[in-house]
Amino acid sequence: GSSPRSGVLLRGCPTHCHCEPDGRMLLRVDCSDLGLSELPSNLSVFTSYLDLSMNNISQLLPNPLPSLRFLEELRLAGNALTYIPKGAFTGLYSLKVLMLQNNQLRHVPTEALQNLRSLQSLRLDANHISYVPPSCFSGLHSLRHLWLDDNALTEIPVQAFRSLSALQAMTLALNKIHHIPDYAFGNLSSLVVLHLHNNRIHSLGKKCFDGLHSLETLDLNYNNLDEFPTAIRTLSNLKELGFHSNNIRSIPEKAFVGNPSLITIHFYDNPIQFVGRSAFQHLPELRTLTLNGASQITEFPDLTGTANLESLTLTGAQISSLPQTVCNQLPNLQVLDLSYNLLEDLPSFSVCQKLQKIDLRHNEIYEIKVDTFQQLLSLRSLNLAWNKIAIIHPNAFSTLPSLIKLDLSSNLLSSFPITGLHGLTHLKLTGNHALQSLISSENFPELKVIEMPYAYQCCAFGVCENAYKISNQWNKGDNSSMDDLHKKDAGMFQAQDERDLEDFLLDFEEDLKALHSVQCSPSPGPFKPCEHLLDG
């Protein structure tokens, strides 16, 4: 029943509903999930909030809430409403929030919405709306937020939106929209957020976003776009852009030339093969750029003006060289992943003072010079596996005080410089068949995990049996891209940090160290006692 509170207010609390003052001499009334089939009758004229969601109300009569002139929020979500008559909201002069989601409406209730001049938020999502009449929002001059997602729209209701010049956020996601015409949102100059994800959009008018001068977030994820959405070029305030999970094959030159404020771009799960060299220029706010498998890229991108990039991943392309000035453009880079390319020669990375992780595995690198990795004081992880490295300058790693992980497996090394590597916790040298010398454990006091070409080389680390072996010990996080983690997410800008996984593994290995000083593989055993004697 009514909350046992005294005062005139609570006399207007319907049976079984929960009522409480809102702090302004008005009443909040919660009648949700009570199995009601009609609206309660004895509501206080001083009601400011009325929740009737999750009931069985199938119809509203004209003027069902007379005299609720102070009502600011009305929730009718999760009922069985198929139609809302003219006059249903008559007299609700203060109404700011109207929730009609999860009903069975087939079109926007134009007449019922007329003259709700104070309305700021309108939820019509999760209905069966296939038609939005041209004038249905014409009286809603204060509307700020509009939800039309999860309906049956097949086209943008262009004319209906023309009257919503104050609108700030709108979602049309989860519909069946196939095309966005020119000037579809031409009068929405205050719109900041626009969600169009999970539609069937295959084409965009060249000027479809013209007029959206305040837009900061645009979500085109999970559509059928075949071409890069060049129409974004007029969105000068755009900060977050998503067009992942489409069918886009190339990103053109100057792709984001009109979007200098971009902070985040999600474009994974597209069959991108080619990216214009100038595509990502002049994006000073961009922090992360990830592009996997663009096999037609042969040149490193020109990132002039994108100086705040912290993470650059450009894998599976055909880049054969890096400009000598690469770090001049990217002074803030912390993570560089250029694995699975055709790199032969490396520039000096010493200007990239903030680099913490470099991944250059699966390239064609044949030599590491003295200046390649000089003075990278923050570098923690360096992966050079699966290259053709035969020569490493004796002092190549001498000024890397933070380096704890080094992977040189599957190269052509016959010797290995130890200078500067005393802080290593992980060292991988397996697959260097010409590397037959013993490495002293004294040079690596912090070592936890080491992988050597031959079993006998593990004897130096006191490993004489394979007591605690974990398969694929090295860097488990590296093989599954962050893109995979995003695939299931229809939401737009979820962020996950792969470093969490690495830290977990490091902690796990720390526990192992307490049991066993160094984990070395391949572990010597009765069938692998002296492989070096049998070689050659």
């Epitope: 041209p134 004319q159 015409p181």
Partner: antibody, heavy 118, light 111 residues
Framework: EVQLVQSGAEVKKPGASVKVSCKAS????????IEWVRQAPGQGLEWIGE????????DYNEKFKVRATFTSDTSTSTVYLELSSLRSEDTAVYYC???????????WGQGTLVTVSS | DIVMTQSPDSLAVSLGERATINCRAS??????????MHWYQQKPGQPPKLLIY???NLESGVPDRFSGSGSGTDFTLTISSLQAEDVAVYYC?????????FGQGTKVEIK
């Protein structure tokens, strides 16, 4: 205040080229299309084409496609129209205008008179 | 190309009287409920000035004696009460499809 300021009048010989500039101010340069329109003496208005400054996005009236070239310089917020192989019938006032609400031309330059005469 | 035909070519109206200019497009310029038709005023020695966009929307700063109507192929610009400063040439323009085209102009004078 939005302004489009065009370069001064030009006199050219037939077969020559002319380059007209249009300097924009008072708004975000790259967010609006710039249209080029010409008006022969005593005649009506004729659309030449459009460019989205900073990008390579251009559209030309088929009639001018071979002879007209639009370029832009974002550092100076300036758009250029170059018209080559001039003939006497190209004598006109050339206007730049901003494509505003729904592509309507809401701000115009003052015009540049190009006279082609031998 | 879409051909825009204005009528009449010239119009003389007394001060304070109504002036009506018509514009017909050779094909519809409507798209998704919007009519991509605009009206401009040009005075001698000046560039054109936008009056009406999308057939019926008054541009900011334009006196409300100017109004536009129509859809599809037939459009009208009305000056409800002609003032001396309204003497000019008036142009309609479509930007429904390339190339964008203008009417030939209607000259409005005082009778």
């Amino acid at each position: 205040e939005v302004q489009l300021v065009q370069s001064g009048a030009e006199v050219k010989k037939p077969g020559a080229s002319v380059k007209v500039s249009c300097k924009a101010s008072g708004y975000t340069f790259s967010a609006y299309w710039i249209e080029w329109v010409r008006q022969a003496p005593g005649q009506g208005l004729e659309w030449i084409g459009e460019i989205l400054p900073g990008s390579d996005s251009t559209d030309y009236n088929e009639k001018f496609k071979v002879r007209a070239t639009f370029t832009s310089d974002t550092s100076t917020s300036t758009v250029y129209l170059e018209l080559s192989s001039l003939r006497s019938e190209d004598t006109a006032v050339y206007y730049c205008a901003r494509g505003g609400h729904y592509g309507s031309l809401d701000y115009w330059g003052q015009g540049t008179l190009v006279t082609v005469s031998s | 190309d879409i051909v825009m035909t204005q009528s009449p070519d010239s119009l003389a109206v007394s001060l304070g009287e109504r002036a009506t200019i018509n514009c017909r497009a050779s094909e519809s310029v409507d798209n998704y409920g919007n009519s991509f038709m605009h009206w401009y005023q040009q005075k001698p020695g000046q560039p054109p000035k936008l009056l009406i966009y999308l057939a019926s929307n008054l541009e900011s700063g334009v006196p409300d004696r100017f109004s536009g109507s129509g859809s599809g192929t037939d459009f009208t610009l009305t000056i409800s009460s002609l003032q001396a400063e309204d003497v000019a040439v008036y142009y309609c323009q479509q930007n429904y499809e390339d190339p964008f085209t203008f009417g030939q102009g209607t000259k409005v004078e005082i009778k």
